[in-house]
């Protein structure tokens, strides 16, 4: 399948001019090769009329241009003072020859249709209201008024000044006069359809001396806007339908054959297969809205439709806006695993794409809950503090430069389960879905700290050790101090484990980690984990709690630190705003209620996460070594 | 709320050509009607041709009809007024209205206008 893009069918009218729009995949190669546009022939042999080397055919000459837009990943063809000899059929396509990756366009140029004279015009959209003005003689005041429609044979009346409605217009035609004038009437006709297009006669009067007006109403399905988008990326509808429709339920549905199946409204509707990946967001009081869908697949091409009305389904009559999605699979987006799998207790490293041409951009993670239109509540991000009720168990690693951040979670429970999705504040397309599943573990976790009960004495060297299995062995072993901005990873000394090896003795493979002395502010959770290179692996959480000597003490932890703090399931995630006191740098980009809140997130704070001294200080040493 | 800016107008021979150019910003067009009127000084503005942007439907005015063309681009949100074979009886103010439909041949159905642009016809 070509993953060239454009209009299948473009019409025009002889003299006027049309603008073609093809879409082509974000590559170097694409945005510099030839672009064509090219005649098709009865042979099969595409003749090229324009193309971006500079050709330009004689029958377009003076009259036509191409024009590349590598920065949109699309090239526009311009032809004026269309002729009907024009209408033919077309390739717009990207190659040093026309058996390139191409997309096929008919263009029809129909002769110029003449508006009917003596006759007033009305064009509007489905959905929308037209009010017909129908002017009449003084003489006729006293006379009934009425508008009926042209059929074949007849005229069929619509209202009449006598209160008779014809069935289909109940509760959709209205006649009236305004004020004083008495020289003309209005019929209003709401809830437009195809249906009502056509030829109308105002009335005035009856026989010779009658006021007659023809009246030419135009219904116009809306045309559909075309979205290039490439798999595994995200797309935004944005349905704006008017004021006149703030009120009522939202949907966003699919096509298919002759109905549209609904995709997610206002009402709570939503299709299982966009389960975890969809937002319906209201934006304003005029009727605004949008939807976002991430996790783009190839099946999600195809024509949408969003509207409104009560019963959040489409219904007839009512306004509408239409979309065709193409799904591009040649994407620049990587497959990543859309589903993480992860155990009680145990951890999970999720690896987030992102844009590599924005490295600097900041990086979020959220959880994405279905109850009412969606939400997304941002847990971390580079310059959000982590969420309360995940302290000491979620961080997020940024790797500039190369195209992926990681973000850990670890001490997992099973309410842990559901969708995150990534996300950052620039290239939108960049957003990504994992599914995480938590089962119950079956087995002793992979790394394990001792003691389990950390209580660390103010003053006094203490230590801790992970334990790690050979099949760790090869892996960097590392200890980070995790705080609300990220995991603080402690200068490590390697105590000579590593010498060539033929066995691999299960008990003794551990990495402590030593607080010498200790400190007040040594107190909080640390993080053993594994990695190679730039890539985490698995983790494990401790509490260590300070406490000043006491004569006699147990050094028991008093509340047992280690067991994660519970969360409470009453607690409402704050889907808006990050709570005050939580984070004071940063709005949470939350449900994406306002895309702009998560453009702007980069300028609300200039302090950086990643910083931090990485030595000691003080006189104290803050070490992790590998045996 | 529509905006719409003329240009084009000048001094032309008899006989000679221009053509006038009425870009809209602001809104799409396309459920409106777009006409073009003129106005000489010392008499009433007066219709010269319209069309329907949705679909290209258009008229032309019997003192004009067979030398003015109107037409449309529909990526520019731009209508054109091709004046060929220009007589001094042409000169005129030309604006360029929008209308959401009725009486297309009348000014009162026209709610934005240009600010004009005009045309000047030397014998």
């Known amino acids: 399948k070509s993953p060239i893009f454009g209009p299948q069918e473009v019409s025009s009218i002889e003299g006027d001019s049309v603008s073609i729009t093809c879409y082509y995949p974000d590559t170097s190669v694409n945005r510099h090769t030839r672009k064509y546009w090219c005649r098709q022939g009865a042979s099969g042999m595409c003749t090229t009329l324009i193309s971006s080397n500079g050709y330009l055919s004689k029958e377009y000459s003076g009259r036509a241009n191409l024009i590349n837009f590598p920065e949109n990943n699309t090239f526009v063809i311009n032809i004026e003072q269309l002729t009907q000899d024009d209408t033919g059929s077309y390739k717009c396509g990207l190659g040093t020859s026309n058996r390139g990756l191409s997309f096929d366009v008919s263009l029809e140029v129909s002769q110029v249709p003449e508006l009917p004279s003596d006759t007033h015009v009305y064009t509007k959209d489905i959905g929308r209201n037209v009010t017909i003005e129908c002017p009449f003689k003084r003489e006729n005041a006293p006379s009934k008024k009425s508008l009926c429609k042209k059929t074949n044979q007849s005229c069929e009346l619509v209202i009449d000044s006598t209160e008779k409605v014809n069935p289909s217009y109940i509760g959709r035609a209205k006649l009236f006069m305004k004020g004083t004038d008495l020289t003309v009437f209005y019929v209003n006709i709401s809830h437009l359809t195809h249906n009502d297009a056509g030829l109308y006669i105002c009335q005035a009067g009856e026989g010779p001396s009658a006021d007659k007006k023809n009246v030419d109403l135009q219904v116009l399905a809306p045309e559909p806007e075309l979205l290039y988008k490439d798999l595994r990326s995200s797309v935004t509808f944005e349905c704006d339908l008017g004021r006149e429709v703030a009120n009522e339920a939202k949907y966003l549905c699919r096509m298919n054959k002759e109905t549209c199946d609904v995709i997610i409204n206002t009402l709570g509707k939503r299709d299982p297969d966009f389960e975890g990946r969809i937002l319906i967001t209201p934006k304003d009081d005029n009727g605004r809205f949008s939807v976002l869908i991430t996790g783009l697949r190839k099946e999600d091409a195809g024509h949408y439709q969003c509207g409104a009305h009560s019963s959040g389904l489409p219904q007839e009559g009512w306004p509408i806006q239409t979309w065709q999605l193409f799904v591009n699979e040649e994407s620049t987006i990587p497959n990543r695993r859309s589903v993480v799998k992860g155990v009680t207790g145990g951890s999970v490293a999720i690896a987030c794409p992102y844009n590599p041409k924005e490295s600097s951009s900041l990086k979020y993670w959220c959880r994405w809950e279905g109850d009412g239109n969606g939400h997304c509540p941002v847990l971390v991000g580079t310059q959000a503090q982590v969420q309360e009720e995940y302290e000491g168990r979620l961080a997020l690693f940024d790797q500039p430069g190369n195209g992926t951040y990681t973000v850990i979670l670890n001490q997992l429970t099973t309410e842990d389960a559901g969708f995150y999705w990534c996300l950052t504040n620039g290239d939108s397309r960049w957003r990504t879905t994992i599914e995480l599943q938590v089962a119950e573990a079956t087995r002793e976790p992979n790394l394990e700290v001792t003691p389990q009960n950390a209580t660390a004495v103010l003053g006094e060297t203490f230590t801790v050790s992970c334990h790690y299995p050979c099949k760790f062995y090869s892996q960097e072993k590392y200890w980070c101090k995790w705080s609300n901005k990220g995991c603080h990873i402690l200068p490590s000394h390697d105590e000579g484990a590593r010498q060539s090896s033929v066995s691999c003795d299960q008990s003794s493979q551990l990495v402590s980690m030593t607080l010498n002395p200790v400190s007040k502010e040594d107190e909080g959770w640390y993080w053993c984990g594994v990695k190679q290179g730039q890539t985490y692996g698995e983790t494990t959480a401790i509490y260590i709690a300070v406490e000043e000597r006491t004569r006699g003490s147990s050094h028991v932890n008093p509340t047992d630190a280690n067991a994660r703090a519970k969360v409470a399931l009453e607690e409402e995630v704050v889907d808006s705003s990050i709570s005050e006191k939580e984070n004071k740098a940063i709005p949470n980009p939350g449900p994406f209620a306002n895309e702009r809140e998560i453009q702007n997130v980069g300028d609300q704070a200039q302090e950086n996460r990643a910083s931090g001294d990485a030595g000691s200080a003080d006189g104290q040493s803050r070490s992790s070594s590998s045996k | 709320q529509v905006q719409l800016v003329e240009s084009g107008g000048g001094l032309v021979q008899a006989g000679g050509s221009l053509r006038l150019s009425c870009a809209a910003s602001?809104?799409?067009?396309?459920?409106?009607?777009v006409g073009w009127f003129r106005q000489a000084p010392g008499k009433e503005r007066e219709f010269v041709a319209a069309?329907?942007?949705?679909?290209?439907?258009?008229v032309t005015a019997d003192p004009v009809k067979g030398r003015f063309t109107i037409s449309r681009d529909n990526a520019k949100n731009t209508v054109y007024l091709q004046m060929d074979s220009l007589k001094p009886e042409d000169a005129a103010v030309y604006y360029c209205a929008v209308s959401r439909g009725g009486a297309y041949e009348y000014s009162r159905a026209y709610e934005y206008w240009g600010q004009g642009t005009l045309v000047t016809v030397s014998s």
């Open positions: 602001g809104r799409t067009l396309r459920s409106y009607i």
């Open positions: 069309v329907t942007w949705s679909d290209g439907r258009r």
